[in-house]
Interface confidence: low
Amino acid sequence: GYKAEVMVSQVYSGSLRVLNRHFSQDLTRRESSAFRSETAKAQKMLKELITSTRLGTYYNSSSVYSFGEGPLTCFFWFILQIPEHRRLMLSPEVVQALLVEELLSTVNSSAAVPYRAEYEVDPEGLVILEASVKDIAALNSTLGCYRYSYVGQGQVLRLKGPDHLASSCLWHLQGPKDLMLKLRLEWTLAECRDRLAMYDVAGPLEKRLITSVYGCSRQEPVVEVLASGAIMAVVWKKGLHSYYDPFVLSVQPVVFQACEVNLTLDNRLDSQGVLSTPYFPSYYSPQTHCSWHLTVPSLDYGLALWFDAYALRRQKYDLPCTQGQWTIQNRRLCGLRILQPYAERIPVVATAGITINFTSQISLTGPGVRVHYGLYNQSDPCPGEFLCSVNGLCVPACDGVKDCPNGLDERNCVCRATFQCKEDSTCISLPKVCDGQPDCLNGSDEEQCQEGVPCGTFTFQCEDRSCVKKPNPQCDGRPDCRDGSDEEHCDCGLQGPSSRIVGGAVSSEGEWPWQASLQVRGRHICGGALIADRWVITAAHCFQEDSMASTVLWTVFLGKVWQNSRWPGEVSFKVSRLLLHPYHEEDSHDYDVALLQLDHPVVRSAAVRPVCLPARSHFFEPGLHCWITGWGALREGGPISNALQKVDVQLIPQDLCSEVYRYQVTPRMLCAGYRKGKKDACQGDSGGPLVCKALSGRWFLAGLVSWGLGCGRPNYFGVYTRITGVISWIQQVVT
């Protein structure tokens, strides 16, 4: 009997080049008679071309939707109604081959060929891509707001914003052949709901999506995206109605950058350079392939790759890597964007060197990848520290904080967060080391106090990279480093001459001269601390809501004591830059730190002075009494305080606090308070300083008010951002 074939719709999208026609501006306007007339002719030609091949029996419909340069490029889609079993056989490559074959067969033919009546189609300029009915629907929804732009070499073209009467717009971008397009998106509003999708082809083909961005991203205020070639499409979908365009788009053609390097590393440890995808920090392009060959000077060394917010993971079952594929010594790894630092350590077993390949396996790409490379000693990868196998990083060992996710850096410690005497492995508290009084049996705590020592968890690193044994030597009035760098940048941490916080007391003017009040429209929102002439530090979560993300909203007050009145010592500033820690995660409160750059430098006075910043190795001993200050609520759920409150709190061991908060306390957090509660920070204190007084009389910033369960509740300590855990980022920004 006769069996009906099951027919399915197969959609193709593509472009062809016409050699005997030239592009004109009229063809960018869909309403123009030139566009209508050219479209009719091109549609006819396309249909005749398809039906001239064996695809003709499957032809269903077609449409030429746009034109471009080159001399004239026609962009089209068509649908074939094909038997289901032929679906795989009629791939875009096969369809392209059939059409090219047809074009070539008539190039020198004198016979009349319908599709050659008006157009001389270049067989080499034909491109056919796989599409879907959904793609065509998406394309059609943008045609009421369709913009074609050709951008020449050396040009940067700023694109006209969307038509706000439309719900969707498409920018069809084209550049010179053999170049690649680089699109720059800059969000200009603090909040919006607009969506932009960038494609590696002329229309919105889902399979050729490079990336999509949504809603005035604060994490990425500027996004640069590379296409694999000279054609790109950008689709805008309307969010909330806005009188302002929430973004600026500009595009420029750029040359292909080779991504192949041969390097020989020097005979030294630490970072020796940077490898990155082309045009970093632009998103890498859909057809990126990098090959880096690194030669190591000796088998004593291994190769370390240090990544920022990106890690390498083994991928199961040969699934494609969605965030970049890496092959290192024939091992296949997949990239993964994370909110942590990461290092890949590659043992070297042969002098031939190491080849590292990076490939974008799919059209979907992501932020450019940059990696610092260098050597490490294979026999001692982390001198004085612990190698965390989970993330490849060197972390402090036995300092009372589990820096490694598996906690192995705090296992098998003879002395945890204390000094181990050489003689008998007795443990003594760190402030007793190099204090002039021998506490170990044979005085080993007072040895080597005037000379350089190997760097370790509690040693202080001088500017010349040498280390000193004395803990917390900064700004104590005695130079301990050979280069005197421990006594530099010491104009900080001194209280002014001075005669909310739950369970606190009112502060006097000049008592906490680094205290800042961060306000929006005259309302105190968060605390902060002055750390340099133009920088105030606070908590990142103060800016969590989109409506709080704009620098324009904020005013910073310094020298303030009373919220409802001003006194001559207080000064105010606008904010010129707001930087959240790149690893800040709202849900976990990790890396809860932000820096505000003031619009002009502070003039120091008795009421306005910066607090001292601790070195990464600074040890704030659990049990130490420190102080928190702020205008936060005086009771849980209460209104903010009019007067600046101060309260002393005790630093809590990390493992104890971690237990209370069910292991949600990360190495970037520090706990303070009391088992009985009562004295604590509260709403409105967020971002304010937790400061501890050194023996020198100077105050050092230990933490920032971050989170906690309620305010002053028994058994629940306050959780603070640990400054020593984020100090390298702070220094990198401020200097």
Partner: antibody, heavy 122, light 108 residues
Framework: QLQLQESGPGLVKPSETLSLTCTVS??????????WGWIRQPPGKGLEWIGS???????YYNPSLKSRVVISVDTSRNQFSLKVRSVTAADTAVFYC??????????????WGQGTLVTVSS | SYALTQPPSVSVSPGQTARITCSAD??????GYWYQQKPGQAPVLVIY???ERPSGIPERFSGSSSGTTVTLTISGVQAEDEADYYC???????????FGGGTKLTVL
Amino acid sequence: QLQLQESGPGLVKPSETLSLTCTVSGDSISSHTYWWGWIRQPPGKGLEWIGSMFYSGSTYYNPSLKSRVVISVDTSRNQFSLKVRSVTAADTAVFYCARHNNWGMENYFDDWGQGTLVTVSS
Amino acid sequence: SYALTQPPSVSVSPGQTARITCSADALPDQYGYWYQQKPGQAPVLVIYKDSERPSGIPERFSGSSSGTTVTLTISGVQAEDEADYYCQSADSSGSYVVFGGGTKLTVL
């Protein structure tokens, strides 16, 4: 009510430097929303944009005048200034300062000073 | 250098409609703006973003955009509308401000 007021000498000798100041009242020049610009109009002719600046000190200039022009800001006085070096008679014009809305795709002047005539003559 | 082209003059009788055009290659990618300038006075913005009217500008002023041309339309022209009209935009990169040469509108 925003007001802009240009001030400076009405007569400048050829080859000297023309200096003008614009005093802004009714809005802070340090507002993050606006740029501030200078435009000139030779007698009987059209408008020509000279350049614009942001309160932070960022500037950009008309390419044809770039080599001779400097725009600077004094946020404490809520003023911005224009200097044009090596003037000739062709620089004789009414000079306007204006608030420049240069936000997103927008790029226009929504408030202007009343203008001041500067004549270049020996 | 990049230029915006305007007709030098347009004449119209009171109550009629006046149309002033401004053309340039970058206008499909950049917005157009219109200013009115009366003798001895500073320019006043009458249309922004091709077709939007600032508050305080009469409804008879409107703007439109088509391809490489923006148009200022004054319907029901009044004697007080006699003035010079300047269009303004930016070059194709969006970097530099450019003014048209101006059009003198005469109300007959």
